[in-house]
C-alpha cells in the first residue's frame, strides 16, 4: 500500500497533501514544500521532511541540540535542496550565497564557503550513534529487555532492517543505539539509517511524523522510559573536511 485509501492520508508522513488523483483514482500524497510524490508505505527522506518543516508554520526549532563534538548537527534548521530521489544534494547554499557540503543525513561536513565551493559527491553517513539519557527510575532497566524493545521499535515502527541496528549499549542512565549501514549493505527498498534516526529523534521530542498514530510512548516491560536528553553523532564513510581553527 502507498497511502490509506479510505480517507486518503499518508500513514508515514503527516506533512503531506493527499488526493485521489493517482493512477486509477488511487490516493497519492505529495510532501509539503517540495511537492514531490512520496511512498507512504515507508519513511519519507529526511531532506523532504526538512523542506516540509521549513514550509510549515512554527519553524524556529533547532534540529538537534548543539554540542562541541564533530558531526553533531550544530547548524540548526535550514531549507535544503533535495535531488529528484529526495536525497540531500551534496552542496547546500542559503539565500545569501553561503554554501557548504553535507553528508547523506544533511549535516554540514565542511567549512562554509561561497558559490565557488565544490562538493564532488554526497558522502554517505554509515554509522549513527544515538545517545540518550533517561530520567531517573526506581532501578536500572534490564539490559536485554531494553535491547529487545529498542530493536523491535526500529524494526516495527521505522521499518529498519534488524541487521542495521548494530548494538544497544546501556549504562544507567545513558542508552546508546548504534546504527550502521554501508553503501554496499543498503539494498533497494531498505530504510536509510539517517531517515530512521530522524523519525526517532522527532518521536523522542514529541513531534511524531506519523499520521494519526499515538506519539511514541517508550516503555520497557511496562516501565516508561522517559528521555531527558538526546545527542546524535554522525560518522561518514569519508572523514569531514574542516579547517583546524574550527577544532580549537
Amino acid at each position: 500500500h502507498t497511502a490509506a485509501q479510505d480517507n486518503c492520508t499518508c500513514p508515514t508522513n503527516k506533512m503531506t497533501v493527499c488526493s485521489p488523483d493517482g493512477p486509477g483514482g488511487r490516493c497519492q500524497c505529495r510532501a509539503l514544500g517540495s511537492g514531490m510524490a512520496v511512498d507512504c508505505s515507508t519513511l519519507t527522506s529526511k531532506c523532504l521532511l526538512l523542506k516540509a518543516r521549513m514550509s510549515a508554520p512554527k519553524n524556529a526549532r533547532t534540529l538537534v541540540r548543539p554540542s562541541e563534538h564533530a558531526l553533531v548537527d550544530n547548524d540548526g534548521l535550514y531549507d535544503p535542496d533535495c535531488d529528484p530521489e529526495g536525497r540531500f544534494k551534496a552542496r547546500q547554499c542559503n539565500q545569501t550565497s553561503v554554501c557548504w557540503c553535507v553528508n547523506s543525513v544533511g549535516v554540514r561536513r565542511t567549512d562554509k564557503g561561497d558559490l565557488s565551493l565544490r562538493c564532488d559527491e554526497l558522502v554517505r553517513t554509515h554509522h549513527i550513534l544515538i545517545d540518550l539519557r533517561h530520567r531517573p527510575t526506581a532501578g536500572a532497566f534490564n539490559h536485554s529487555d531494553l535491547d529487545a524493545e529498542l530493536r523491535r521499535l526500529f524494526r516495527e515502527r521505522y521499518r529498519l532492517h534488524p541487521k542495521f541496528v548494530a548494538a544497544v549499549h546501556y549504562e544507567q542512565p545513558t542508552i546508546q543505539i548504534e546504527l550502521r549501514q554501508n553503501t554496499s549493505q543498503k539494498a533497494a527498498g531498505d530504510v536509510d539509517i539517517g531517515d530512521a534516526a530522524y523519525y526517532f529523534e522527532r518521536d523522542i521530542k514529541g513531534e511524531s511524523l506519523f499520521q494519526g498514530r499515538g506519539g511514541l510512548d517508550l516503555r520497557v516491560r511496562g516501565e516508561p522510559l522517559q528521555v531527558e536528553r538526546t545527542l546524535i553523532y554522525y560518522l561518514d564513510e569519508i572523514p569531514p573536511k574542516f579547517s583546524m581553527k574550527r577544532l580549537t
Epitope: 524493545e149 530493536r151 521499535l153 516495527e156 515502527r157 511496562g222
Partner: antibody, heavy 123, light 107 residues
Framework: QVQLVQSGAEVKKPGASVKVSCKAS????????MHWVRQAPGQGLEWMGI????????VYAQKFQGRVTMTRDTSTSTVYMELSSLRSEDTAVYYC????????????????WGQGTLVTVSS | DIQMTQSPSSLSASVGDRVTITCRAS??????LNWYQQKPGKAPKLLIY???SLQSGVPSRFSGSGSGTDFTLTISSLQPEDFATYYC?????????FGQGTKLEIK
C-alpha cells in the same frame, strides 16, 4: 490484586451494535494497555485491538477496522469496546486483557484477563 | 500479518507424562512469544511470557524455549489440572495473532 470485571451477556439483532465494558482495579489504570480478544463458540482466540488508556490511542485488527471502537474513561478506570453492524459470525465471548506493554503500540503479554462477555447475535 | 502455527492440534497423554507443544511463526518474532492455558468456560491464563519466562504463580513444571520462529512449551510431568487447551501468541507486532490451539486430553 489486579481485577478486570466485564459487563454482562448481551443478545443483539443483526445490524445492531454492542458496547462491552471492562472495569479495571488493583493497578494504575493508565500505566498498562488493554487488549480485546474474542472467541467464537468452539473456536480459537482472535485478537481485535489494543487501547492505550493514558492517551486513548488505538490500533485495531484490519478485520474489524471501521466496525470496532475502543474507548476509555479514566475517571472510572473502565475501557469499552463497541462493535457495530453485528452479524451472526460475531457471536462470541469477548475478553478484555491487560498488557504491561512495550513502546506503544507494542505488546508484551496479556497477564490478566476479564471473565468474558458472551455476545449472541441472532434474528 | 504474522501467522502462528501450533502442533499438534490435539494430544492425548497420561498423568506423569512429559508433553511438548510447538509453535512456529511465519517470520522472526525474536522472543516475543507467550503461552496461555484455557479451560472450558474460563478466560485464558498466562503461563509463559517472552518465550521462556515463567509467569508468577505458575508451577515450575511448565517451561518455554525458542527464539526467532520456533518455540516450544514443555510440561515436564502432567498433572490432572493440566488437561486444557494451550495457545501461543506473538506479541511482536500488530495484529497480535494466536496459534489455533492445542487441546491436551487424558489418554
Amino acid at each position: 490484586q489486579v481485577q478486570l470485571v466485564q459487563s454482562g451477556a448481551e443478545v443483539k439483532k443483526p445490524g445492531a451494535s454492542v458496547k462491552v465494558s471492562c472495569k479495571a482495579s488493583g493497578y494504575t489504570f493508565t500505566g498498562s494497555y488493554m487488549h480485546w480478544v474474542r472467541q467464537a463458540p468452539g473456536q480459537g482466540l482472535e485478537w481485535m485491538g489494543i487501547i492505550n488508556p493514558s492517551g486513548e490511542s488505538t490500533v485495531y485488527a484490519q478485520k474489524f477496522q471501521g466496525r470496532v471502537t475502543m474507548t476509555r474513561d479514566t475517571s472510572t478506570s473502565t475501557v469499552y469496546m463497541e462493535l457495530s453492524s453485528l452479524r451472526s459470525e460475531d457471536t462470541a465471548v469477548y475478553y478484555c486483557a491487560r498488557d504491561p506493554g512495550g513502546s506503544w503500540p507494542f505488546s508484551y503479554a496479556l497477564d490478566y484477563w476479564g471473565q468474558g462477555t458472551l455476545v449472541t447475535v441472532s434474528s | 500479518d504474522i501467522q502462528m502455527t501450533q502442533s499438534p492440534s490435539s494430544l492425548s497423554a497420561s498423568v506423569g507424562d512429559r508433553v511438548t507443544i510447538t509453535c512456529r511463526a511465519s517470520q522472526s518474532i525474536s522472543s516475543y512469544l507467550n503461552w496461555y492455558q484455557q479451560k472450558p468456560g474460563k478466560a485464558p491464563k498466562l503461563l509463559i511470557y517472552a518465550a521462556s519466562s515463567l509467569q508468577s504463580g505458575v508451577p515450575s513444571r511448565f517451561s518455554g524455549s525458542g527464539s526467532g520462529t520456533d518455540f516450544t512449551l514443555t510440561i515436564s510431568s502432567l498433572q490432572p489440572e493440566d488437561f486444557a487447551t494451550y495457545y501461543c501468541q506473538q506479541s511482536y507486532s500488530t495484529p497480535y495473532t494466536f496459534g489455533q490451539g492445542t487441546k491436551l486430553e487424558i489418554k
